[in-house]
C-alpha cells in the first residue's frame, strides 16, 4: 500500500487532513498529548479504518472502545474506505486519559479522496485501476513481473513529414496515438476540493528529454491532445474538476535505452495543499508509474520472412529475377530500391537492420540505420520508415567509422539456452578485432553501447577483422531445422572444401575446372588448387580464424558440434593479409524460411553437377531446406559481397514477449 503523510493531532484545535484512498496514513497522537495522560482511545466514522499496533512485538488491533497505553511504541495508522462527499465528512476522535484528570478530546476531520495514476502495469494491453494493486513504482522482469511499457514513437504516420512522430509536439491522429501508452488519472473528491489543492504531473529533469506526455481533452466533437510534459516541460499543473473524474494521458518515449539511459521513466502525480496563500504549497501525496522503454529487438533467420529488400543496379536483372522467384516461393513482399535511389550502392544488408519494438498494445517494425552512409544513405529514412514503421540510428553520421560498422557485421542467433541461462530472443553477434592495434577495426562504440543497452539479446563479440570486408556474414549463417535446437549454425569451412576437392581428385577428377562457364575469368583445375602451397597456407590461417569463432559460438550460444554444419569454402589473403572468398561465398546466403538463396559457387562440374552445390544440398536438404543457387558472380562476388550482402529481410516478430524474460 502506498505511503501517505503523517498527521499530528492536538487537543487545542481540530485538525483537518486529506487521506488518499489506498494509502496508509500515520497518526501522531503522542507528541501533542496532554502531559498527565497515560492512555488513549480512538473512535472513528464508519469510512475510516484505524489500526493500532503496540510493539515491539507489534500486536495489531482494529479500534473498538479499548484504551491503549500512551507511549512511543504505539503506532496508529489510518486508511479510508470511501471517498468523501464533502470536505471533512469523516471524523476521528482521540480521547486521552489520565489518573487525575477528566478525558481530553482531540478531533481530526478527514477528507477521503481517490487519486490514482493508472497504466498498463500488468502488461495486458489494457489500463486497469490500480488501487490496492502491486506497487507501480517498481518495474520487474519475467512472467510474474510488473510495470508499464513505452514505445519510442519513431515511425512517421504523417507521410508529408520528413521527421519521426516523436520529433514533434503534436498528435497527428488516432494512428499516432496508438503508438503511445495510455495513462489515466482517476480522481474522486468533494466538489470544492481543488479550491485548496492542486495536482501536478511531473518527470525527473534527467528523464524529461526521454519522454513526452500528451493530455487528451475531450471536446463535444472530437478528442484533442496537447503536450503537458516533455523535453521543455518537466512539470505541469493539472486543471481537475471536483467530483469523480478521469483524465487520459498518452505517453511516448523519445529515446531508446542506451549507455546514458537505462530505459526507465517515472511519471509522478503530486497532490499539493495550496490552502495557505502565505506559505509554499505542501506535498500531501504522490503516486508514480514507472515505464520501461521497449528495446529494439533483432530477428534471426529462423523467424518467418515477411518482406525482402534488394537493389536494382546495372546488369543485375538476372539476380533480381532469382530473388523475386525466391520471395514468391516464401510468400514474401519484395521491395526493390531503384538505381536512381541507390546511387550504385547495392549493399542492402550493410545499410540497415530491421528489427521491431513491442508493447502489450502494439508491435512496430523498426529499421536500424547504419552509419555507413553510402549511396543507400537515404533509403531507410525515405523508403522504409513510414506509418507503423519506425527508425533509429546511432554512431557518427560523418566519418569516423570502419567497414565493421556496416550491418553485414550484425547478426542475431536464434533462441538459445547457455548453461541454464535462457536467451529466448537469441543473442546479437557482431565482429571485432581480436585485440586492439593501430590499424585494427572495431564496430563503433556508440553502436556497441546501443546494442548492449537493449538488454534482451546480450551481444557476443566475434572475430572478423581478419576478413577484407570484415563482416560476420562472410563466415556464418543460421538456418531453421526441424530437430535439436530448431536451427543449425552454418560455418564457412576451408577444411571441408579441401576434403571435397581431394576426394574428387582421388576419383580421377583433378582436371575438373573451377569457374567453368564464367567469361573473362581464369579457370582453375582442382589439381592446381590442391597443389598451390600459398593458397593452402592462406586457408590454414582462415581456418584458424573461423575455428576461434566456432569455439566462441559453441561457448556463448551453448552449441554442440552436431548443431554446426560446415559449408565448403576457400578464401585467399589479399592486401594487408585480409581474407576474401576465393569463389562465391556460399555461407553468405539469403534465408527465407525453408527457401535458401545461395551464391552459385561455379565449382568443378563432375558428372554434370557442380560438386560444391551437390555437397551443400546433401548437407541442407535433409533439414527440409530447398537450395536455390543464384549467380551473383560479376554483380556481387567480384565487388566483395554476395547474396546476403545484397539483400535484406523484415521478419515476423517473436511470439515470446520480451518483458517475460529475465536478462
Amino acid at each position: 500500500m502506498a505511503q501517505g503523510t503523517l498527521i499530528r493531532v492536538t487537543p487545542e484545535q481540530p485538525t483537518h487532513a486529506v487521506c488518499v484512498l489506498g494509502t496508509l496514513t500515520q497518526l501522531d497522537i503522542c507528541s501533542s498529548a496532554p502531559e498527565d495522560c497515560t492512555s488513549f482511545s480512538i473512535n472513528a466514522s464508519p469510512g475510516v479504518v484505524v489500526d493500532i499496533a503496540h510493539g515491539p512485538p507489534a500486536k495489531k488491533k482494529s479500534t473498538g472502545s479499548s484504551t491503549w497505553p500512551l507511549d512511543p511504541g504505539v503506532e496508529v495508522t489510518l486508511t479510508m474506505k470511501v471517498a468523501s462527499g464533502s470536505t471533512g465528512d469523516q471524523k476521528v476522535q482521540i480521547s486521552y486519559y489520565g489518573p487525575k484528570t477528566p478525558p481530553v478530546k482531540a478531533l481530526l476531520y478527514l477528507t477521503g479522496v481517490e487519486i490514482s495514476l493508472c497504466a498498463d502495469i500488468t502488461r495486458t494491453g489494457k489500463v486497469k485501476p490500480t488501487r490496492a494493486v502491486k506497487d507501480q513504482r517498481t518495474w520487474t522482469w519475467g512472467p510474474c513481473g510488473q510495470g508499464a511499457i513505452l514505445l519510442v514513437n519513431c515511425d512517421r504516420d504523417n507521410l508529408e513529414s520528413s521527421a519521426m512522430d516523436c520529433e514533434d509536439d503534436e498528435v497527428l491522429d488516432s494512428e499516432d496515438l496508438q503508438d503511445m501508452s495510455l495513462m489515466t488519472l482517476s480522481t474522486k473528491t468533494p466538489k470544492d476540493f481543488f479550491t485548496n489543492h492542486t495536482l501536478v504531473l511531473h518527470v525527473a529533469r534527467s528523464e524529461m528529454d526521454k519522454v513526452r506526455v500528451f493530455q487528451a481533452t475531450r471536446g463535444k466533437l472530437s478528442s484533442k491532445c496537447s503536450v503537458v510534459l516533455g523535453p521543455k516541460w518537466p512539470s505541469h499543473y493539472l486543471m481537475v474538476p471536483g467530483g469523480k473524474h478521469n483524465m487520459d494521458f498518452y505517453v511516448e518515449a523519445l529515446a531508446f535505452p542506451d549507455t546514458d539511459f537505462p530505459g526507465l521513466i517515472t511519471l509522478t502525480i503530486s497532490l499539493l495543499d495550496t490552502s495557505n496563500l502565505e506559505l509554499p504549497e505542501a506535498v500531501v501525496f504522490q503516486d508514480s508509474v514507472v515505464f520501461r522503454v521497449a528495446p529494439w529487438i533483432m530477428t534471426p533467420n529462423t523467424q518467418p520472412p515477411q518482406e525482402v529488400y534488394a537493389c536494382s543496379i546495372f546488369e543485375n536483372e538476372d539476380f533480381l529475377k532469382s530473388v523475386t522467384t525466391l520471395a514468391m516461393k516464401a510468400k514474401c513482399k519484395l521491395t526493390i530500391c531503384p538505381e536512381e535511389e541507390n546511387m550504385d550502392d547495392q549493399w542492402m544488408q550493410d545499410e540497415m537492420e530491421i528489427g521491431y519494438i513491442q508493447a502489450p498494445h502494439k508491435t512496430l517494425p523498426v529499421v536500424f540505420d547504419s552509419p555507413r552512409n553510402r549511396g543507400l544513405k537515404e533509403f531507410p529514412i525515405k523508403r522504409v520508415m513510414g506509418p507503423d514503421f519506425g527508425y533509429v540510428t546511432r554512431g557518427p553520421q560523418t566519418g569516423g567509422i570502419s567497414g565493421l560498422d556496416s550491418f553485414g557485421n550484425l547478426e542475431v542467433s536464434p533462441p538459445v539456452t547457455v548453461r541454464g541461462k535462457e536467451y529466448p530472443l537469441g543473442r546479437i553477434l557482431f565482429g571485432d578485432s581480436c585485440y586492439p592495434s593501430n590499424d585494427s577495426r572495431q564496430m563503433h562504440q556508440a553502436l556497441q553501447d546501443f546494442l548492449s543497452a537493449q538488454q534482451v539479446q546480450a551481444p557476443v563479440k566475434l572475430y572478423s577483422d581478419w576478413l577484407s570486408v570484415g563482416h560476420v556474414d562472410e563466415f556464418l549463417s543460421f538456418v531453421p531445422a526441424p530437430d535439436r535446437k530448431g536451427f543449425r549454425l552454418l560455418l564457412a569451412s576451408p577444411r571441408s572444401c579441401y576434403k571435397l576437392f581431394q576426394e574428387q581428385q582421388n576419383e580421377g577428377h583433378g582436371e575438373a575446372l573451377l569457374f567453368e562457364g564464367i567469361k573473362k575469368k581464369k579457370q582453375q583445375k582442382i589439381k592446381n588448387i590442391l597443389s598451390n602451397k600459398t593458397l593452402r597456407e592462406h586457408n590454414s590461417f582462415v581456418e584458424r580464424c573461423i575455428d576461434w569463432n566456432r569455439e566462441l559460438l559453441k561457448r556463448e550460444l551453448g552449441l554442440a558440434e552436431s548443431d554446426i554444419i560446415d559449408i565448403p569454402q576457400l578464401f585467399k589473403l589479399k592486401e594487408f593479409s585480409k581474407a576474401e572468398a576465393f569463389f562465391p561465398n556460399m555461407v553468405n546466403m539469403l534465408v527465407l524460411g525453408k527457401h535458401l538463396g545461395i551464391p552459385k559457387p561455379f565449382g568443378p562440374v563432375i558428372n554434370g553437377r557442380c560438386c560444391l552445390e551437390e555437397k551443400v544440398c546433401s548437407l541442407l536438404e535433409p533439414l527440409g531446406l530447398q537450395c536455390t543457387f543464384i549467380n551473383d558472380f560479376f554483380t556481387y562476388h567480384i565487388r566483395h559481397g554476395e547474396v546476403h550482402c545484397g539483400t535484406n529481410v523484415r521478419r515476423k516478430p517473436f511470439s515470446f514477449k520480451w518483458w517475460n524474460m529475465v536478462p
Epitope: D439, S468, K522, N528, T534, L535, R639
Partner: antibody, heavy 128, light 111 residues
Framework: QVQLVESGGGLVKPGGSLRLSCAAS????????VSWIRQAPGKGLEWVSF????????YYADSVRGRFTISRDNAKNTVYLQMNSLRAEDTAVYYC?????????????????????WGRGTLVTVSS | QSALTQPRSVSGSPGQSVTISCTGT?????????VSWYQQHPGKAPKLIIY???ERPSGVPDRFSGSKSGNTASLTISGLQAEDEADYYC???????????FGGGTKLTVL
C-alpha cells in the same frame, strides 16, 4: 586506364585542416586500391595512407595516424584525405596513386602495395 | 631517416649498366616479395617501373630489371640512356606499424 587529379592543397596555419580530393576519370575508381604518398620539398617519397577498393579497411603511416583520414565516395569516383591538426612537417606535394585490383590469380599478387597510376600532385604548405 | 636504405647517388655512362641497392630488414624486404621501384624525373610524378621484385609493367623497357637477395632488393638498368637520368625509389610492404615503406631515393646521373 584511369587518370587521377588531386585538388584541395594550399596554405594553411599549423593546427589547421585541409581536405584533399583525388578525382578519377577514364575508369571506375571502385575497382582500384588508392594510396596517398607525399614528398616534402627536396626530399624523398613517404607513403601516407591506403584504402582498399571495397572501402572496408584503411591504413596509415605512423606519422599521420589519428590526424589524417582517408575515405572514398565511389559514386563520385573520388577519394579524399582529410588532414587535421596539420604541422609544419606535413608540408609536401601530396600524390594520389592507384592500382587495379587483380581478381584472376589463385593468390593475390599484392597490388595494394605498389602504385601504377599517379596524379600530378597538389602542394600543401603548413606555415604561420 | 628512411626505413629502407638506398645509396644517395649512382652514375654511369650511356650504354653501361648500373645497379641500385635497397636494404631493408627481415620484416619488410626480407619477408615479402612486394618490392617495387619508381622512377621520378624532376618536377614530375613518380612512375612505376618494377613491381613484385622483378615484374615490369607494360611499356617499361626490358633494360630495367629487379631482383632480391635476403633483405636487399636491387634495380639494374642496363644499356643506360640519357633519359634514364632521374631519381629512383624502392618501396616494400612491411609488417611494421607503417605498412608501406619507401627508400630515401637514389639520384642516377648519366655521364
Amino acid at each position: 586506364q584511369v587518370q587521377l587529379v588531386e585538388s584541395g592543397g594550399g596554405l594553411v596555419k599549423p593546427g589547421g585542416s585541409l581536405r584533399l580530393s583525388c578525382a578519377a576519370s577514364g575508369s571506375t575508381l571502385s575497382d582500384y586500391f588508392v594510396s596517398w604518398i607525399r614528398q616534402a620539398p627536396g626530399k624523398g617519397l613517404e607513403w601516407v595512407s591506403f584504402v582498399n577498393s571495397a572501402d572496408t579497411f584503411t591504413y596509415y603511416a605512423d606519422s599521420v595516424r589519428g590526424r589524417f583520414t582517408i575515405s572514398r565516395d565511389n559514386a563520385k569516383n573520388t577519394v579524399y584525405l582529410q588532414m587535421n591538426s596539420l604541422r609544419a612537417e606535413d608540408t609536401a606535394v601530396y600524390y594520389c596513386s592507384s592500382a587495379t585490383e587483380e581478381v584472376d590469380d589463385i593468390v593475390a599478387p599484392g597490388r595494394g602495395y605498389y602504385m601504377d597510376v599517379w596524379g600530378r600532385g597538389t602542394l600543401v604548405t603548413v606555415s604561420s | 631517416q628512411s626505413a629502407l636504405t638506398q645509396p644517395r647517388s649512382v652514375s654511369g655512362s650511356p650504354g653501361q649498366s648500373v645497379t641500385i641497392s635497397c636494404t631493408g630488414t627481415r620484416g619488410d624486404v626480407g619477408r615479402y616479395n612486394h618490392v617495387s621501384w619508381y622512377q621520378q624525373h624532376p618536377g614530375k610524378a613518380p612512375k612505376l617501373i618494377i613491381y613484385n621484385v622483378y615484374e615490369r609493367p607494360s611499356g617499361v623497357p626490358d633494360r630495367f630489371s629487379g631482383s632480391k637477395s635476403g633483405n636487399t632488393a636491387s634495380l639494374t638498368i642496363s644499356g643506360l640512356q640519357a633519359e634514364d637520368e632521374a631519381d629512383y625509389y624502392c618501396s616494400s610492404h612491411s609488417r611494421s606499424s607503417t605498412p608501406v615503406l619507401f627508400g630515401g631515393g637514389t639520384k642516377l646521373t648519366v655521364l
